[in-house]
């Protein structure tokens, strides 16, 4: 089944797909597509690169990681709920019958309706949207959405337990991770 | 005009040996995933390789895997099948088609050419 | 391997006729097939993607639906340059597999 992540409408929401090139500049054909993965390619591509650069990207859909290194994470900016659904990592590694693809589903959830906002929820608003905690692989890798309302003593604890705890891990070991070479 | 057209077929005896080519003109060649295949007398249509449009991934069906090898040559805008120990059911009209990699799905087929393998 | 069944296997039909040709898939496909046409001695040609995506090029008499295991390639009002052999692909499992295909001729 398909890793879940979540996003609120108006947010950018994050897909995570990672390599590792077998060289610095070794790089490895991708491709990101609406809907699961199909045999070959990707269906209903949004977005593709090549052994050099991005070749192909559609508007709202962009790789903000450093895609030469291998994190190919999409990022899709101001989400609606039409953007729900399964999305297809495909990673074309070189060889017979190699490639490694991964189906990601995105759940988009209404915009909460806040009141007016105070120095709090600026102070709130500011703080990471996502945070990205790892089980012990893919299957078990969750997002989480917005976080709570919380105050300063809470974003102090919180901020400290970040550092302590396996959230702190880098988001290169929570999405869909895979090594060549 | 966006075109395929494949050669290199013809009479073989079973145990040897054909190389199919497949040029391609109206387009940007490495841009697209490419296939073979083929069609036995009389019969329906079956798969039989892809390759990606940079040429490192590759698929082959089980009829076929370690006798036939496919390739590309995008400086020269052209696909290949390099076809070992052919047996009398590889007798087939085969075709390259393109695969429309906005889409995952085969957009452009060429004309065939015939592989008779007879003894 | 994904085993895809066309119905009927053959039909006869007239001019101005709508035909319908179903394709049902041994497992889900999601919307992942194709609709070809072959006429004798020539090369196929792609109608259909994606279910129900037309290709470019390709009338809109033409039309395709279904989602899952249970696919149908309509055609709207047969005319003669339409007696063919119609082929169904899946294109969401390895290995890529073909309909046995569906002649339509003329009655």
């Known amino acids: 089944s398909e890793v879940e992540y979540r996003a609120e409408v108006g947010q950018n929401a994050y897909l995570p797909c990672f390599y590792t090139p077998a060289a610095p500049g070794n790089l490895v054909p991708v491709c990101w597509g609406k809907g699961a993965c199909p045999v070959f390619e990707c269906g209903n591509v949004v977005l593709r690169t090549d052994e050099r650069d991005v070749n192909y990207w559609t508007s709202r859909y962009w790789l903000n990681g450093d895609f030469r290194k291998g994190d190919v994470s999409l990022t899709i900016e101001n989400v609606t709920l039409a953007d729900s659904g399964i999305y297809c990592c495909r990673i074309q590694i070189p060889g017979i019958m190699n490639d490694e693809k991964f189906n990601l589903k995105l759940v988009i959830k209404p915009a909460k309706v806040t009141p007016a906002p105070t120095r709090q929820r600026d102070f709130t608003a500011a703080f990471p949207r996502m945070l990205t905690t790892r089980g012990h692989g893919p299957a078990e890798t969750q997002t989480l959405g917005s976080l709570p309302d919380i105050n300063l003593t809470q974003i102090s604890t919180l901020a400290n337990e970040l550092r302590d705890s396996r959230l702190a891990n880098d988001l290169r070991d929570s999405g869909a991770t895979i090594r060549i070479g | 005009q966006v075109q395929l057209q494949e050669s290199g077929g013809g009479l073989v005896k079973p145990g040897g040996s054909l190389r199919l080519s497949c040029a391609a003109s109206?387009?940007?060649?490495?841009?697209?995933?490419m296939t073979w295949i083929r069609q036995a007398p009389g019969k329906g249509l079956e798969w039989i390789s892809y390759i990606s449009g940079g040429g490192g991934s590759i698929y082959y069906a089980d009829s076929v895997k370690g006798r036939f090898t496919i390739s590309r040559d995008n400086a020269k805008n052209s696909l290949y099948l390099q076809m070992n120990s052919l047996r009398a059911e590889d007798t087939a009209v085969y075709f390259c088609?393109?695969?429309?990699?906005?889409?995952?799905?085969?957009?452009?087929w060429g004309q065939g050419t015939m592989v008779t393998v007879s003894s | 391997e994904i085993v895809l069944t066309q119905s009927p296997s053959s039909l006869s039909a007239s001019v101005g006729d709508r035909v319908t040709i179903t394709c049902r898939a041994s497992?889900?496909?999601?919307?992942?097939l194709a609709w070809f046409q072959q006429k004798p001695g020539r090369a196929p040609k792609s109608l259909i993607y994606?279910?129900?995506s037309l290709q470019s090029g390709v009338p809109s008499k033409f039309s395709g639906s279904g989602s899952g295991t249970d696919f149908t390639l309509t055609i709207s009002s047969l005319q003669p340059e339409d007696f063919a052999t119609y082929y169904c692909q899946q294109y969401n499992s390895y290995p890529p597999t073909l309909g046995p295909g569906t002649n339509v001729d003329i009655k």
């Open positions: 497992q889900g496909i999601n919307n992942y």
């Open positions: 088609a393109r695969g429309n990699w906005g889409s995952a799905a085969l957009d452009i």
């Open positions: 994606a279910a129900s």
């Open positions: 109206g387009f940007t060649f490495s841009d697209y995933y």
